[in-house]
C-alpha cells in the first residue's frame, strides 16, 4: 500500500539566464528510496540519482544541470525553452513509484521572482 506523499516546489518562475532549484520531498512513508529520476516536459531524462551509484547527469544537460541540493536538481543558464513541466520520480521499496510535478516558467522580465513554496500536487 502506497502511503507516501510527494511534496514539490509547485509552480515556480525564474529569470532568463538565471538558475532555479527543482525540489521534491517524499514524506509519510518508511519506504526505501532506491532511485530518483528527473524528467523534462518532453519526457527526456535530465538526471538520475541512484542510491548506490550516485548522480548521473545526462550528456545533453551536463553543462546546465547540477545535482542537488539533496535529491533535488539545479537548472542553470535558463532559457525560454526551459519553460514547462518537470517530473521527479521516486522509485521506492516496497511501495513502488511516486511521481511529483513542477511547472517552471522562465520570464524575460527582471522582476521575475523564484517562489520556493512547497505544495502537494
Amino acid at each position: 500500500m502506497m502511503t507516501g506523499t510527494i511534496e514539490t516546489t509547485g509552480n515556480i518562475s525564474a529569470k532568463k539566464g538565471g538558475s532555479v532549484i527543482l525540489q521534491c520531498h517524499l514524506s509519510s512513508t518508511m519506504a526505501q528510496v532506491t532511485q530518483v529520476n528527473w524528467e523534462q516536459h518532453d519526457h527526456s531524462l535530465l538526471a538520475i540519482r541512484n542510491a548506490e551509484l550516485g548522480w548521473h547527469i545526462y550528456p545533453a544537460f551536463k553543462d546546465r544541470v547540477a545535482p542537488g541540493p539533496g535529491l533535488g536538481l539545479t537548472l542553470q543558464s535558463l532559457t525560454m525553452n526551459d519553460t514547462g513541466e518537470y517530473f521527479c520520480t521516486y522509485h521506492t521499496y516496497p511501495d513502488g513509484t511516486y511521481r511529483g510535478r513542477i511547472f517552471l516558467e522562465v520570464l524575460e522580465s527582471s522582476v521575475a521572482e523564484h517562489s520556493a513554496r512547497f505544495q502537494i500536487p
Partner: antibody
Framework: EVQLLESGGGLVQPGGSLRLSCAAS????????MSWVRQAPGKGLEWVSA????????WYADSVKGRFTISRDNSKNTLYLQMNSLRAEDTAVYYC?????????????????WGQGTLVTVSS | EIVMTQSPATLSVSPGERATLSCRAS??????LAWYQQKPGQAPRLLIY???TRATGIPARFSGSGSGTEFTLTISSLQSEDFAVYYC??????????FGGGTKVEIK
Amino acid sequence: EVQLLESGGGLVQPGGSLRLSCAASGFTFGPYGMSWVRQAPGKGLEWVSAISGSGASTWYADSVKGRFTISRDNSKNTLYLQMNSLRAEDTAVYYCAKDPGTHYSGYYYIWRYWGQGTLVTVSS
Amino acid sequence: EIVMTQSPATLSVSPGERATLSCRASQSVSSNLAWYQQKPGQAPRLLIYSASTRATGIPARFSGSGSGTEFTLTISSLQSEDFAVYYCQQYVPHPPFTFGGGTKVEIK
C-alpha cells in the same frame, strides 16, 4: 555495509554438479537484481547469469544455458547457482554481484558490490 | 554477441604519469559502458558507468569518455594503488553482458 559471501565451490569431476550460494547482508535483498560473474584462472571476467528481484526473470550466457540455473530465496537473503553437466572450461572463481537497480527503476547490469568469490575446479 | 576489445594488453607507466586505456565494441553500445579495476586476489571494483560517470567514491583522476563503439579510460596521474588490471564491460539492455579482455597497467 553491503556484504556478499559465496560458498559451495570445490573440486568436481566433469559431468558432475555443484550448487553455489551467496549470502547477502547489509541491504534490503528483495528488490535488487543479482548476477553471477566468473573468472577462469589468469583470464578475464565473464558474465554468467542474472536474476530479477522477484526471481521471475532470469538470463544466461550461451556458454551455460541449459546447464546452469540461477535462483534466489528472498526470505533467506540468498542467491543460488545450480551448475549441472560441468565441464573443464567451467573452472573459475565465481562471484556473486549486486545490481544497483530494482524492478521499478530498471536493472543496470553493472555491479558495484561483489563477493570475494568461490573457486570451482572441474577436473578428473 | 557484442565483442569488446581492449588495447593495449599491457601498459607500462611511471607513477605520476597519465595512462590512457582503450576499449572498442564490435557494434554500438551507445553509452552503456562501464570500467572496472581489479587487483590480484580481489573482486573487481566499479569505476565508471554510462561511459563517463564516476561511481560514488571514485577519485577524480579517473575519467571516461566515448560513445558508440570507441571508449577511453584515462587515469590523469597514476598513483601506486592504481597499478592493476582494468576491464571494460558493455551492458546494452539485453544479455549477454560482455567484458573486454583487460588491460594490465604496470609500473615502468
